[in-house]
Amino acid sequence: ILGGREAEAHARPYMASVQLNGAHLCGGVLVAEQWVLSAAHCLEDAADGKVQVLLGAHSLSQPEPSKRLYDVLRAVPHPDSQPDTIDHDLLLLQLSEKATLGPAVRPLPWQRVDRDVAPGTLCDVAGWGIVNHAGRRPDSLQHVLLPVLDRATCNRRTHHDGAITERLMCAESNRRDSCKGDSGGPLVCGGVLEGVVTSGSRVCGNRKKPGIYTRVASYAAWIDSVLA
């Protein structure tokens, strides 16, 4: 997260760290007791590595009573996700067992009504991604509030030049932005999950390259079918 601040500890009990061989790889969001939603591209280079999900965490390194690492029983990328596109960049991870819920671990309601969030709406994005252009990784969860950007502006040639489909949304990126390592994390508007940080190699913090988020409402049928 660029231009953000340290989050209040455990105030986002839905927040997950998707880990590869014990190290933070991507963000994720608990959407059901046994399911975490993240980004499909996160596992592209995972190969034979061990993928796990950390829940109930604020610090990645310090011991915390609520922290627990779960193995992954099943990883389900969206069937239409492809390595070279930002489209359909969703991944559902089934935990090896139901998460132990509590004040620091709780699923987040997700948007099912397929309607765009109004431009200018302030939404919260959180993650353990890099916090500066030098690539410094934080130990504790960071967050930032970002205004939603209208799709027409996001589709301008100097922005994302027509790449933003109806199944994607954008948020402003003027110094405050999601960045590498935040992919798969939640964009939360009015206490509801609206978007998932896409995992392209986008430049961060440049206002002409807005953050791109996959709209979960557009994938409600797929999410329901996997969770069923």
Epitope: P119, D150, R151, A152, T153, N155, R156, R157, T158, H160, D161, G162, A163, I164, E166, V203, N206, K208, K209
Partner: antibody, heavy 116, light 112 residues
Amino acid sequence: EVQLVESGGGLVQPGGSLRLSCAASGYTFTDYYMNWVRQAPGKGLEWIGDINPVTGDTDYNADFKRRFTFSLDTSKSTAYLQMNSLRAEDTAVYYCTREGPSFAYWGQGTLVTVSS
Amino acid sequence: DIQLTQSPSSLSASVGDRVTITCRSSQTIVHSNDDTYLEWYQQKPGKAPNLLIYKVSNRWSGVPSRFSGSGSGTDFTLTISSLQPEDFATYYCFQGSHVPVTFGQGTKVEIK
């Protein structure tokens, strides 16, 4: 299939007004800026300006700012170009073109002739 | 405003010829996001322009590989490696990096 269809061109006297329409189909109208470009007979392409179909924000080439105005009817997926105080040198084919990707999609153009 | 100057203004060539059109801008067209929004359009009489190349060197969908773009800063080139009958048209460069966006004056490619 993305389609842009202009209409409203024709013969108008110097000093007169005309409103051109650009009807869009095959995509969500509010997801892309609309630009207007004109081409005088035997001449090159000249950018008039653009409009954001969500906010209505406009940007005009300084040469057109005083006499030309963009508007929208999102319920009809249509953009409009209102041209006032027309002069002989405004005689041209007027195009609308969607921005994103680049100017990949254009209308067929509509001819405006300013003559007495 | 940024001026784009194309050369030549017109040229005569034969089918199979290699054709090069240049476009020079009055100032750099590198955008603040580090991309260069230099595009090339082809226009045939009575028709709307067609996008050929975007961001200096990227071919638009369906554009034949004989069309290529290159350049940086202020100097750009459109090359047609082997001219085909359907390529006789007018070609325009365009910069979208700075408002007002601008077109070159055009290069007419005619049959020799």
